[in-house]
Interface confidence: low
């Protein structure tokens, strides 16, 4: 809060602007008449250093002149880079109740001369853009500092344009606001940067340049795709560019895909084939530009033409399987299941599926077409039976895949041998297998199926399956795996003609049952129990149940239980019991055991057999 | 927040002369792809024409080249498409649309890459 000077002046020699390490002298002077009232031997000026506004130093050590009552002159050193503030005030000594009285103050600037501008930069973006430059300054001068941008080309033709830098802002970088036409692409332009402070000036070297050198093209636009006679594998791709683009870059890739396919094009005019598409598949397509072959720069990537090749028929075999079931004596239901194509061979939508049976000998053909993998029919159990189906999309059908229909499991000595099946974790089963042993014919390939263990599942849900080689004897099998379920899984060996099968049950992850079987009924017959009880819910078992336990012991005893195992058998559901003593009243309950442990008990049933028991 | 409001559209007989205007606001014009597109009952619609303000292209469908001229006026935020010699054939919705956000193989006539779309014109031309 200097008001304005009213009391005196304060000046700065050589300059209020210093370089770096200079001292200056800094003399503060009473104007006539100001002053300690009719006492100018008790004026004191007194001279304060204010940094950030904050007074750092009183600087009444630093005189180096004195003139009584009326002025007094400073040196100042080791000033600090930036903007330190000087206030001159007066001290009456008389009156020493009053505060010093401000007099003038003076601002001194510390900086350093501007290093030349280096590493200049143009560019001009498109043919139609402006041309604009960047540098780099150098160190820091802590002074306002300007910058002029000076552009000159041929015929003496000049154009220049100014910025500064201060602590608020910083300049190093001007759009010249002017475009180069490609027909000045032979010329050469020189740009030059200088650099103007109150500590000095300086001027980069001067940067040489073509059109060439400067220009980078915009990013190709109106992207679009012609597929040639609607293939899906060959493509016309089609763009706009500036006129004076000679190379251009296509990249091209499916749209869940990591990698782009990379191709180079020279003078393209906007035009480029591609042969190499996969057809029914959504790609992304980017372009981009130069002006020169062997100079200038690359264009940003355009924006990006998202498209779907058209479809075209589909390739591939289909992977079918079947399960037959005799109806009555003369019947019998085929049940065909086919592997969807994965998109690669279906090369568009699957439409529908046509799907043959046919009896060998060609008597009797049934034909159909369905959307479903599967379809059910039922046919005479007399004569050879053959199946095919293909997949059809807009374009056309695949080869059909042939099955020959014979008894899956009708053949022992095709069984496959030492059937096994291990938990490999949470989502697999490990199944291994030995070849049939007295095979009379050739085993052609294995066929691994796998079924939940749950009511309803042969009606409800399809099997799922895998084709192994031959010459294969495991196979991991994941699809559609969950813990805590139990899996009948079958290996079927197949011939030509014939077919032999071996069956295990699996799980992935298993936990002893939540509960035990429920027993509904104990009858005495012929001197046996037996003992009928209910299954435990599908969800409840936690994996495949290895086998039941039925506990009994006499009513009040403390004595520990007798118990019978019984196999797992999902089809049995009652057992005789022969130990126990007539007109004895026993508590049986039963549990169920997986690979993890035993479950909890089930209900427990009191009974008193009446006959005579062993 | 964005807006497109197309004016112009009328009735006129053949072989007269139109012009649409689409005042944007919201919207600057700078860098973009701009166009009007037009339906007519029971087909899908189509591209008319386009300018991109980026590099100053304009595109024409082959039907109205020679006939139909856009431009913008920047000062303004409006968009223009003079149509002349017009034809039965003419008739339908005429649309404003601006930021061509996403490319389709069809380009600039595409009508699903335009981010902003105005309600639309009415225009007959009988014969």
């Known amino acids: 809060n200097i008001d304005v000077c009213k009391l005196g002046t304060v000046t700065v020699q050589p300059a209020p602007v210093i370089p770096l390490g200079s001292a200056a002298n800094i003399s503060c002077s009473l104007n006539p008449k100001q002053g300690c009232s009719h006492y100018p031997s008790s004026n004191e000026l007194i001279l304060l250093k204010f940094v950030n506004d904050v007074l750092v130093e009183n600087l009444h050590g630093k005189k180096v002149h004195d003139h009584t009552g009326h002025s007094s002159t400073f040196q100042v050193t080791n000033l600090s880079l930036g903007m330190t503030l000087f206030v001159c005030k007066l001290n009456c000594s008389n009156s020493q109740k009053k505060p010093p009285v401000p007099v003038c103050g003076v601002e001194i600037s510390v900086g350093v001369a501007p290093e030349p501008p280096q590493n200049i930069s143009c560019v001009q973006e498109g043919e139609n853009g402006t041309v604009a430059c960047s540098w780099n300054s150098g160190k820091v001068t802590y002074l306002k500092t300007n910058y002029t941008l000076q552009l000159s080309g041929p015929n003496n033709l000049t154009c220049q344009k100014q910025c500064f830098s201060d602590n608020r802002q910083n300049c190093n970088r001007l759009d010249l606001g002017i475009n180069l036409s490609p027909d000045l692409a032979e010329s050469r332009f020189i740009v030059r940067v200088t650099a103007i402070n109150d500590l000095g000036n300086s001027s980069s070297l001067p940067h040489t340049f073509t059109f060439l050198d400067i220009v980078i093209p915009l990013p190709p636009w109106d992207i679009r795709i012609n597929f040639l006679n609607a293939s899906g594998s060959r493509g016309t791709l089609q763009w706009e560019d500036e006129g004076q683009v000679v190379l251009n870059q296509l990249r091209y890739q499916p749209l869940n895909s990591t990698s782009w396919n990379m191709v180079n094009a020279t003078n393209a005019k906007g035009k480029y084939d591609l042969r190499d598409l996969r057809p029914f598949t959504e790609y992304e397509f980017q372009i981009s530009s130069k002006l020169h072959l062997s100079g200038g720069s690359w264009s940003n990537w355009s924006e990006s033409l998202r498209t779907r090749t058209p479809e075209e028929e589909p390739v591939g075999i289909l992977d079918i399987w079947y399960m037959k079931q005799d109806i009555d004596y003369d019947r019998q239901q085929i049940s065909l299941f086919w592997k969807s194509l994965n998109p690669s061979e279906a090369r568009g939508k699957i439409l529908h599926y046509q799907v043959t049976l046919q009896e060998v000998t060609k008597k009797t053909t049934l034909q159909n077409t369905t959307r479903h993998t599967s379809w059910t029919r039922v046919i005479p159990r007399t004569g050879a039976w053959t199946a095919s189906v293909s997949a059809a999309n807009s374009k056309g059908a695949s080869a059909p895949t042939h099955i020959n229909i014979v008894d899956l499991c009708g053949t022992g000595l095709l069984a496959p041998h030492q059937v096994s099946a291990k938990s490999e974790n949470m989502d697999n089963i490990l199944v291994t297998w030995q070849p049939p042993k007295k095979a009379d014919s050739a085993v052609r390939e294995y066929i691994v199926e796998w079924r939940a263990l749950q009511p309803g599942s042969i009606t409800k849900f399809p099997p799922h399956w895998l084709r192994i080689p031959p010459d294969n004897m495991s196979a991991l099998i994941s699809e559609n795996i969950k813990p805590y379920i139990c899996y009948e899984i079958r290996v079927h060996a197949l011939s030509e003609s014939q077919g032999g099968c071996s069956s295990i049950r699996g799980d992935s992850k298993h936990k002893a049952p939540v509960s035990g079987p429920h027993i509904t009924a104990i009858t005495e017959k012929k001197e046996r129990l037996f003992i009928s009880w209910t299954h435990i819910p599908f969800p409840e078992q936690r994996g495949c149940i290895l086998h039941y336990r039925i506990y009994w012991k006499e009513r009040d005893s403390t004595a520990q239980p007798e118990l019978c195992e019984i196999q797992y058998r999902r089809s049995q559901n009652s057992h005789p019991i022969s130990s126990l003593q007539p007109r004895v009243t026993y508590v049986l309950w039963m549990t169920a055991v997986t690979a993890a442990g035993e479950s909890p008990q089930g209900n427990e049933r009191e009974f008193c057999p009446q006959g005579k028991a062993n | 927040q964005v807006q497109l409001q197309e004016s112009g559209g009328g009735s006129v007989q053949a072989g007269g002369s139109l012009r649409l205007s689409c005042a944007v606001s919201?919207?600057?014009?700078?860098?973009?792809?701009m166009g009007w597109f037009r339906q007519a009952p029971g087909k899908e619609r189509e591209g008319v024409a386009a300018?991109?303000?980026?590099?100053?292209?304009?595109y024409y469908a082959d039907s109205v080249k020679d006939r139909f001229t856009i431009s913008k006026d920047t000062a303004k935020n409006t968009l223009y498409l003079q149509m002349n010699s017009l034809t039965p054939e003419d008739t339908g919705m005429y649309y404003c649309?601006?930021?061509?956000?996403?490319?389709?193989?069809?380009?600039?006539?595409?009508?699903?890459?335009?981010?902003?779309w105005g309600q639309g014109t009415q225009v007959t031309v009988s014969s």
């Open positions: 300018i991109y303000t980026g590099a100053g292209n304009i």
């Open positions: 649309a601006a930021d061509l956000t996403r490319w389709y193989s069809g380009g600039w006539r595409d009508p699903r890459g335009y981010k902003y």
């Open positions: 919201g919207y600057t014009f700078s860098n973009h792809h």
